[in-house]
């Protein structure tokens, strides 16, 4: 017949007891059963006692009473009484359960997780359940996500059972968080705290934290450690495969490090203890979570005994430049184990010879190349717990850029003048290594007599390389060379003499080497003018005459030429433009500007400056001249004229020194007749003597001169006698 | 790098306006709750409001309720607070924070970004 | 005036214990989780125990956190001068439906 399922004393599918009363139970079946009770039910505990009697018509039946002492909210949950050693198959008809609620208005839920939430894994898609079940099935629990969403429940996606918690159907991304389950019991608050974690398949990244290649001696221990990193909510396999995996030479310890709030870290050491040459291969370690796969690998080389090989990298004699940021000085080094390394310069230790020089590997860097690094360089390598020693030299030239000394001295802010006809010696000393040569170069100034540009040197104009017999530009006399030892350097000395400076234009001395060229230019600018610039006042005009002053100036130095007069008004000193560059007149060397004030008035005297601009400098010049206009005054005689006897045939000076403003002019008269300059008559400068050569007879007479200007005239009268024979009457 | 930064702090006039904007990086924005708390010279912290991963609830302080308001654009991974109404107790160093990893705490903050409220 | 109060200040020598306290109320410490943040002057503040007790990665085991009823404290072991700094407490409100802080402890380092 077919088997009767046993019946519990209380009917139905569920029953609420209150929290400290006593369960009763019974189990009425036709077979041996046994109880299954909540995982917090202990049925080691004293609280909980099962009893077995037979029962029933003629005790047939077998009977369990399950009696709970003083029963608490965690023993919540499934109770049920099934047969013995009945197929599974026929689990309905063998089993009869009931869910049991133990109702604690203290504890509304059967697991409160309020100190430390409890993590739930959950995958997208899939049935998601937050089990905060009650203790009493008609609590109202109300889930929310922190800090401010609510999970309704809608009896589809999210369904709210008692006596499993909140089941969310089809979980998504919306549901990974904080969880909170809330329920208010008599007003008091209760919460209990879950939080999901999506479980995902990301590996972000694997690797093996030793060097690669790994090297390693004979008999020694291999560690290889694999990190395979991923999101918190990520679980990894992780496995090696490795040269002797058959014979399971390797030991795998495992961790992982839960520590970061941001990722997980999965840890797989593999150690194979005292290596032999069969240990030697590719080692390589896969991370599996689901379908996501990641591997990473490393060789692993296994050497018999230490060793050191070392060659140059290119040749044996290298060469780098001074002023390079940083030189790296490397050999070609195989070796293990891992040598110490020393470098050595001329025999000393490198690097405490200067802080510019650090060891890298088997490289020496030298920081800021000076031509002091130049030398011999010895890299020293030992494994000394292997008595293994080798050592290599290498020659290294440091070239340096040609410098011209003069360049670096010069302070004139703007070029020399050379006088015009001038013989010149030009030099230019030059250092670089290699020794550079010099070679001289001309370059003619641009000649502009247009009115808009003043004269000017440019890098325009062609230039021509100079030898001892170029005829190009000036004459030069001679290019010569000579080495010399300055400041302990052997420095090269070109110098170029000019025999005539004529041509105004630029010598450039040209330093060259490999490395590089270098240039001095010297402006050659020719001058007529003393210092290159001169005011010349032609004399200091007296009331109506004219006022003549000329300022001359170098025309490769100077430009934008002009006279001014300065005047004082309220102890201020006014400029006043007078003339200007227009009106210059250009020559081969220099400007000349003139200045002309006709029929001049006292009120034009004053303070006159000729004013130019430095080319190079762009300072203003000026150089003054003080002109003070004379007043008209008539003209007086220094000293009267005086009688006075002469001999025949010798010779005699009349003199008429006047003064007066302007400047009288003087008129010579003999016996009321006007003297005119005729053979034997000389009449001296500014005719204020009158000379007579071989006297005669007929030269005696009243000498009568007169001084005159605009203001008036004045006079002086003379008798010259004429004592002795003429050569003709002796003749007679 | 997980970061945030905020900007848009100035000098405004009482009554004025002003958007603070806070740009997240190094992290999934869109999953978290984000916060903006403030601290004005020498004074202790003071929370702002408080926006839904999905920016579709909000909470805000009763000092500030009625005159600012919190949002987010997940697509620009930015969170803003608009702050109308200004007064002078408003100015302050306002930092913006936020929820990620598993401490739901604040365990993300920005550099902040400083609001002056003065005539 | 804050929600959860702190002392003001509390002070310790190298090597010392120092406890901080915060203290709230049901609808605050009692039913949420209680964080401590650090702020070093001049920058932003910095979580220092989340969830009641627990630390995050970076964070010396010398801080503790603990929790019992409407208080909650954060205690600093074996202080180290860059220790110096204000904390703050901080919890959801339920009533307020927010973050409350409490108003700060300047933490100072003697000696």
């Known amino acids: 017949s077919k088997l009767k399922g046993p019946e519990l004393s209380l009917k139905g599918t569920q029953h609420v007891t209150q929290a400290g009363q006593t369960l009763h139970l019974q189990c009425r079946g036709e077979a041996a059963h046994q109880w299954s009770l909540p995982e917090t039910v202990s049925k080691e505990s004293k609280r909980l006692s099962i009893t077995k009697s037979a029962c029933g018509r003629n005790g047939k039946q077998f009977c369990s009473t399950l009696t709970l002492n003083a029963a608490q909210a965690n023993h919540t949950g499934f109770y049920s009484c099934k047969y013995l050693a009945v197929p599974t198959s026929k689990k309905k008809e063998t089993e009869s359960a009931i869910y049991i609620f133990i109702s604690d208005t203290g504890r509304p839920f059967v697991e409160m997780y309020s100190e430390i939430p409890e993590i739930i894994h959950m995958t997208e898609g899939r049935e998601l359940i937050i089990p905060c079940r009650v203790t009493s099935p008609n609590i109202t629990v109300t889930l929310k996500k922190f800090p401010l969403d609510t999970l309704i429940p809608d009896g589809k996606r999210v369904i709210w059972d008692s006596r499993k918690g909140f089941i969310i159907s089809n979980a998504t991304y919306k549901e990974i968080g904080l969880l909170t389950c809330e329920a208010t019991v008599n007003g008091h608050l209760y919460k209990t705290n879950y939080l999901t974690h999506r479980q995902t398949n990301t590996i972000i990244d694997v690797q093996i934290s030793t060097p690669r290649p790994v090297k390693l001696l004979r008999g020694h221990t291999l560690i290889l450690n694999c990190t395979a990193t991923t999101p918190l909510n990520t679980r990894v396999q992780m496995t090696w495969s490795y040269p002797d995996e058959k014979n399971k030479r390797a030991s795998v310890r495992r961790r992982i490090d839960q520590s970061n709030s941001h990722a997980n870290i999965f840890y797989s050491v593999l150690t194979i203890d005292k290596v032999q040459n069969k240990d030697k291969g590719l080692y390589t370690c896969r991370v599996r979570s689901g379908p996501s796969f990641k591997s990473v690998n490393t060789s692993v080389h296994i050497y018999d005994k230490a060793f050191i090989t070392v060659k140059h990298r290119k040749q044996q004699v290298l060469e780098t430049v001074a002023g390079k940021r940083s030189y790296r000085l490397s050999m070609k080094v195989k070796a293990f184990p891992s040598p110490e390394v020393v470098w050595l310069k001329d025999g000393l230790p490198a690097t405490e010879k200067s802080a510019r020089y650090l060891t890298r590997g088997y490289s020496l860097i030298i920081k800021d190349v000076t031509e002091e690094d130049a030398g011999n360089y010895t890299i020293l390598l030992s494994i000394k717990q292997s008595n293994v020693f080798k050592n290599l030299t290498a020659t290294l030239i440091v070239n340096v850029k040609p410098q011209i000394y003069e360049k670096a001295v010069s302070s004139f802010p703007d070029p020399a003048l050379y006088p015009l006809g001038s013989r010149q010696i030009l030099t230019c000393t030059a250092y670089g290594i290699p020794r550079p040569t010099i070679k001289w170069c001309w370059r003619p100034c641009n000649h502009n007599h247009s009115e808009a540009r003043y004269d000017f040197c440019s890098n325009n104009e062609e230039s021509f390389i100079l030898d001892p017999d170029s005829n190009i530009g000036n004459r030069i006399e001679s290019i010569t060379q000579r080495m010399a030892i300055i400041e302990g350097k052997n420095k090269t000395a070109s110098t170029l003499v000019v025999a005539d400076s004529r041509i105004s234009g630029i010598y450039s001395c040209i330093a060259s080497n490999k490395v590089g060229t270098v240039g001095r230019n010297i402006s050659f600018y020719i001058t007529d003018v003393p210092n290159g610039f001169h005011v010349n006042l032609e004399k200091m005009p007296t009331e109506g005459e004219d006022l003549k002053l000329s300022c001359t100036v170098n025309k490769f130095l100077y430009r934008d030429v002009t006279w001014i007069l300065l005047r004082t008004v309220n102890n201020r000193t006014m400029h006043y433009s007078i003339s200007k560059q227009k009106m210059a007149i250009t020559k081969e060397h220099s400007i000349t500007l003139n200045l002309t004030i006709m029929n001049v008035s006292l009120e034009d005297s004053g303070t006159y400056a000729c004013r130019a601009r430095n080319v190079y400098t762009g300072e203003e010049i000026l150089q003054k001249k003080e002109v003070t206009i004379r007043d008209q005054e008539a003209p007086y005689l220094l000293r009267n004229l005086s009688d006075h006897t002469v001999a025949i045939s010798s010779s005699t000076t009349l003199d008429c020194h006047a003064n007066g403003a302007p400047e009288p002019q003087i008129t010579w008269f003999k016996n009321n007749h006007k003297i005119q300059q005729e053979p034997g008559i000389i009449l001296g400068p500014g005719s204020s003597t009158l000379f007579i050569e071989r006297v005669t007879e007929e030269d005696e007479g009243v000498y009568h001169c007169k001084a005159t200007n605009q203001k008036g005239s004045v006079e002086s009268s003379a008798y010259l006698t004429v004592q002795g024979t003429s050569d003709k009457s002796n003749l007679e | 790098e997980v970061q945030l930064l905020e900007s848009g702090g100035g000098l405004v006039q009482p009554g004025g306006s002003l958007r603070l904007s806070c740009e997240a990086s190094?992290?999934?924005?869109?999953?978290?709750?984000m916060n903006w708390v403030r601290q004005a010279p020498g004074k202790g912290l003071e929370w702002v409001a408080t926006?839904?991963?999905?920016?579709?609830?909000?909470s805000h302080a009763p000092a500030v309720k009625g005159r600012f308001t919190i949002s987010r654009d997940n697509s620009k991974n930015t969170a803003y607070v608009q702050m109308n109404s200004l007064r002078a107790e408003d100015s302050a160093v306002y930092y913006c924070?936020?929820?990620?990893?598993?401490?739901?705490?604040?365990?993300?903050w920005g550099r902040g970004t400083t609001v002056t409220v003065s005539s | 005036q804050s929600v959860l109060t702190q002392p003001p200040s509390a002070s310790g020598t190298p090597g010392q214990r120092v406890t901080i306290s915060c203290s709230g109320s049901?609808?605050?410490?009692?039913?949420?989780?209680v964080y401590w943040y650090q702020q070093l002057p001049g920058t932003a503040p910095k979580l220092l125990i989340y969830?009641?007790?627990q630390r995050p990665s970076g964070v010396p085991d010398r801080f503790s956190g603990s929790k019992s009823g409407t208080s909650a404290s954060l205690a600093i072991s074996g202080l180290q001068s860059e220790d110096e700094a204000d904390y703050y407490c901080?919890?959801?409100?339920?009533?307020?439906?927010?973050?409350?802080f409490g108003g700060g402890t300047k933490l100072t380092v003697l000696g």
């Open positions: 190094g992290f999934d924005f869109s999953t978290y709750a």
């Open positions: 969830f009641n007790s």
């Open positions: 049901s609808s605050n410490i009692q039913n949420n989780y």
């Open positions: 926006i839904n991963s999905e920016g579709t609830i909000t």
């Open positions: 924070s936020s929820t990620t990893g598993t401490t739901h705490g604040m365990d993300v």
């Open positions: 901080g919890t959801w409100d339920d009533s307020l439906n927010g973050w409350v």
